[in-house]
């Protein structure tokens, strides 16, 4: 493991006094119930804390909410419950914070059963003031802000009405009835599924996908026979019931539903699902569930049109029951993803891809670590990291893996070293190169967070006993120092820092328990005096991402280009600062066949980089042809991987083949080939086609 505090770890001098001067305690005058915390805006220092205590009675819930506001990153809080007229706030809706730095907040109140509609409290000045507004409906979901204009809100009512406000919730208008699911699209577009028969739960697969571009003045039905729909990047996806009505197929649109193409993916039955794991404007990761209750499926990666898919990973773990998958985008390094597979022996194993799903490999174990009891060969094993599946199965894993785009290369995760994920107590592992290499950083499970763009990592041991110690590292997890933040230990409930990892402040939340009462308490620690000076040019060093072989003149080339970053030296103890911008320099690489995927009608034989033509097109591959326009049906066998920027080098040129004559399908009747029937998918949640679980873009 990394050197402990007593070895080479005396980098930060006199830190106890510096941190003690910057530790702020706040005791909340509350009975302990639940607490939720939200940051309002970026770099504003404004935090809202909502505490709720409720006693469920037979006929109603009696409860009390308190609202607190801080404008100094949590060092001090002011009780502002009077601004919301001491109203009980519905915690299931949380605090709806506006996008960007709009300063908007919406709180949804609990109202008595007989009322005509719900009630919200609105603020547009970072929660300094609130306006009470009575709604003409009872909300079913949290208010949804338009990403383009935070004055425009969308809400579904308990009676399945779709309501829109154009003046930040002051006035509401019902624009459509019998709506099952609604989402904001691009440029103020609203997409929703509706069932004109009135039921959302029973008639999935018979929904219409509709679109309005003028906030409800006019509508266009863009697809029918919809099961569910999702948005990811530039793509609009729909799972559509097929002719016989027992299977669903994915259709894709890149023009907001005006035209559709069928995705070259296997159709699924009623007990299966599709799930978009990740999507951007260039490509999509799509999970297709296996038939039966297998708990796994296959990941496919798309081309830039979202229609042609290459098989990326088989036996991908994704439980049907709870909808858990360990799929994670490692945001600190381009092209890196981790997930878990369910091996033939039913063990769960971690894999990582460094090239956007092109190839998946086991995670390299730390150099000095021993293989655990799961390993058949004590010398040969890999690192396995815990994610959503481990948490769902009740393992002692307090946090998902963590990475931040501005903390380049840094990844923190719980894990174990062996042949598979272990049920034993995990340790914390850290990678500083985006997952290529790892060190064991901390013994046992911890909560952790990244501050100052990676300049500081803070961790707290996960324990059932009260705690009063935090650990911090200024060298990306190699060395750790401990600080006792209070004499009186607290029952720890959470670690909070401003999203974006730019802050220097960390808040430790917990409660104190005495004979009769328990109270919420927070400790906010500001690390500004630990990192005394601003970082200078000499504090940064050049680092090549994805470097695996320095002697290769294609070293670091991923998706056709390599990137050199200026990274903080581990030995430098200084502030990146709130305005820190990652400095990176890309350079184009020469093309190789690995920069191309096989186009429709072509495949790669195993251990071969060349794409060869499929002898004949049959089965579900033919469905791709159904709505394909002519240009979609001519190919040279290769297509540049989405986002690949290579130039020169290998340029695979093939004779252009017309695949139209090979396209024959009775999948849907020809007369149905219009914008209504070859559409997209919408649904009302539930197990299948999961489009929104834990940052998953879409799960039907």
């Amino acid at each position: 493991s990394a050197p402990g505090e007593d070895e080479e770890c005396g980098r930060v001098r006199d830190f106890v006094a510096k941190l003690a001067n910057n530790t702020h305690q706040h005791v909340f005058d509350d009975l302990r119930g639940s607490v939720s915390l939200s940051w309002v805006g970026d770099s504003t220092g404004v935090i809202l804390v909502l505490t709720t205590f409720h006693v469920p009675l037979v006929i109603m819930t009696f409860g009390q909410s308190k609202l607190y506001r801080s404008e100094d990153y949590g060092k001090n809080f002011k009780d502002i419950t009077d601004l919301i007229n001491n109203t009980f706030i519905r915690t299931e809706f949380g605090m709806a914070i506006g996008p960007e730095n709009s300063g908007k907040v919406v709180l949804t109140a609990e109202v008595s059963g007989g009322s005509r509609g719900g009630r919200i409290f609105r603020s547009s000045d970072f929660a300094k003031n609130f306006v009470q507004t009575d709604l003409p409906f009872h909300p079913l979901t949290q208010m949804m802000y338009s990403p383009q204009n935070s004055d425009y809100l969308l809400a579904l009512s308990t009676e399945n009405g779709l309501w829109v406000s154009k003046n930040f919730g002051g006035k509401w208008e019902e624009i459509h009835k019998t709506v099952c699911l609604a989402k904001w699209g691009r440029k103020g577009t609203i997409f929703f599924t509706a069932n004109h028969n009135g039921s959302c739960s029973n008639d999935r697969g018979m929904l219409e996908l509709e679109r309005t571009t003028d906030y409800g003045k006019s509508f266009k039905t863009v697809a029918s026979k919809i099961y569910s729909f999702g948005l990811g990047g530039k793509f609009l996806f729909a799972s559509v019931m097929t002719g016989k009505g027992t299977l669903r197929a994915i259709h894709v649109s890149v023009d907001d539903g005006d035209t559709w193409n069928m995705a070259q993916l296997p159709p699924v039955g009623h007990e299966q699902f599709y799930s978009i794991l990740a999507a951007n404007d260039e490509m999509v990761f799509m999970h297709v569930d296996e038939p039966g209750d297998s708990g796994f499926g296959t990941i496919y990666v798309s081309d830039d049109r979202g229609t042609v898919y290459s098989k990326s990973l088989e036996r991908h773990l994704y439980t049907t029951t709870g909808g858990e998958t360990d799929f994670i985008n490692v945001t600190s390094l381009r092209g890196v993803f981790t997930t878990s597979i369910l091996a033939e022996d039913k063990s769960v194993q971690s894999v990582i891809s460094f090239d956007q799903g092109g190839e998946w490999v086991p995670l390299r174990k730390p150099a000095d670590s021993k293989c655990d009891a799961t390993a058949r060969d004590p010398e040969k094993c890999s690192l396995h990291i815990h994610a959503a599946y481990s948490i769902a199965t009740g393992l002692n894993v307090p946090m998902l893996p963590l990475s931040e785009p501005n903390a380049v290369g840094l990844v923190l995760a719980h894990g174990s070293v062996g042949d598979a994920i272990s049920v034993m107590r995990p340790d914390v592992y850290v990678s500083d190169d985006g997952g290529y290499t790892w060190i064991k950083a901390l013994e046992g499970p911890h909560y952790y967070t990244i501050l100052d763009s990676g300049g500081i990592i803070v961790a707290i041991e996960h324990s059932s006993r009260p705690i009063n110690v935090i650990k911090f590292s200024t060298d990306e997890g190699q060395c750790w120092q401990t600080y006792t933040f209070t004499r009186d230990p607290i029952y720890f409930t959470g670690l909070a820092s401003e999203p974006g990892a730019r802050s220097m402040n960390i808040s430790i939340w917990g409660f104190t328990e005495s004979f009769l009462t328990s109270q919420w308490v927070s400790y906010t620690i500001d690390f500004k005096d630990i990192l005394e000076r601003n970082c200078e040019e000499k504090d940064y060093t050049i680092w090549l991402a994805h470097s695996t072989d320095p002697e290769d003149y294609e070293d670091g080339c991923i998706l056709g280009y390599k990137e050199q970053f200026l990274r903080l030296r581990k030995s430098s103890v200084c502030q990146n600062g709130r305005d820190y911008v990652v400095t990176k320099q890309p350079s184009i690489c020469l093309c190789s066949l690995e920069d191309f995927l096989c186009d429709f009608g072509y495949y790669r034989p195993e251990n071969d980089s060349k794409c060869v033509e499929q002898p004949e097109l049959k089965g579900h591959d033919l469905e791709f042809c159904l709505y394909g326009r002519e240009e979609h049906l001519t190919t040279n066998g290769y297509r540049k991987i989405p986002g690949d920027k290579c130039q020169g080098g290998v340029n695979p040129v093939r004779e252009v083949k017309d695949l139209k004559k090979k396209c024959t399908s009775n999948f849907l009747s020809p007369e149905k080939q219009n914008s209504k029937s070859n559409g997209s998918a919408g649904g009302s949640g539930g197990l299948n086609d999961i489009f929104e679980a834990q940052k998953i873009e879409w799960h039907e």
């Epitope: 050049i542 320095p550 290769d552 003149y553 070293d555 050199q564 350079s587 184009i588």
Partner: antibody, heavy 120, light 107 residues
Framework: EVQLVESGGGLVKPGGSLRLSCAAS????????MNWVRQAPGKGLEWVSS????????YYADSVKGRFTISRDNAKNSLYLQMNSLRAEDTAVYYC?????????????WGQGTMVTVSS | EIVLTQSPDFQSVTPKEKVTITCRAS??????LHWYQQKPDQSPKLLIK???QSFSGVPSRFSGSGSGTDFTLTINSLEAEDAAAYYC?????????FGGGTKVEIK
């Protein structure tokens, strides 16, 4: 002292062959990529060829591809350049240069050079 | 191939004066740009690597800056022994290439 010493240069007729050698000392030769760089009289520097530490990667400039062959013998701490089908434009001082150990690193150590003259 | 354009080709400078040599790449090369000094009848010597990192033993008056496509070598206070040709070199992409060189002469 880290040192590279080239030898094998001389006068050769067009179409002829020559083998240059570079003897390394003062560092772990088998850990570094090595290069040949040349400089025509009164002109600038031109990269000729590279070879990685274990000879896995070998690269040539287009102007010498198919005519020159780079090789190394780590046991003897030696780098070689076999030059065939020599042309008048190959006339230059040939330097042997060590590449640093980083990705896309610079040539940090150079030999004193050996003169190759191709003339009838 | 990546073409490196060095300027000026020639510079005549009095001692203690500041010298600035620029090198422009035909496409982005990140920080993979290095500077060499070659005195008459000698082999080249590395001065600066990765655009701005001084090589060991090189006097502090030599410094480099830049990234992407535009790079600069600066000699802060020229000394007589600095009379030489200076070359930039990119190692980002094959074929490896050098700039045409800048000859610095002492007035």
């Amino acid at each position: 002292e880290v040192q590279l010493v080239e030898s094998g240069g001389g006068l050769v007729k067009p179409g002829g062959s020559l083998r240059l050698s570079c003897a390394a000392s003062g560092f772990t030769f088998s850990s570094y990529s090595m290069n040949w760089v040349r400089q025509a009289p009164g002109k600038g520097l031109e990269w000729v060829s590279s070879i990685s530490s274990s000879s896995s990667y070998i690269y040539y400039a287009d102007s010498v591809k198919g005519r020159f062959t780079i090789s190394r013998d780590n046991a003897k701490n030696s780098l070689y350049l076999q030059m065939n089908s020599l042309r008048a434009e190959d006339t230059a001082v040939y330097y042997c240069a060590r590449r640093g150990s980083g990705s896309y690193d610079a040539f940090d150590i150079w030999g004193q050079g050996t003169m190759v003259t191709v003339s009838s | 191939e990546i073409v490196l354009t060095q300027s000026p080709d020639f510079q005549s400078v009095t001692p203690k004066e500041k010298v600035t040599i620029t090198c422009r790449a035909s496409q982005s090369i990140g920080y993979s740009l290095h500077w060499y000094q070659q005195k008459p009848d000698q082999s080249p010597k590395l001065l600066i690597k990765y655009a701005s990192q001084s090589f060991s033993g090189v006097p502090s008056r030599f410094s480099g800056s830049g990234s992407g496509t535009d790079f600069t070598l600066t000699i802060n206070s020229l000394e007589a022994e600095d009379a030489a040709a200076y070359y930039c070199h990119q190692s980002s992409s094959l074929p490896l290439t050098f700039g045409g060189g800048t000859k610095v002469e002492i007035k």
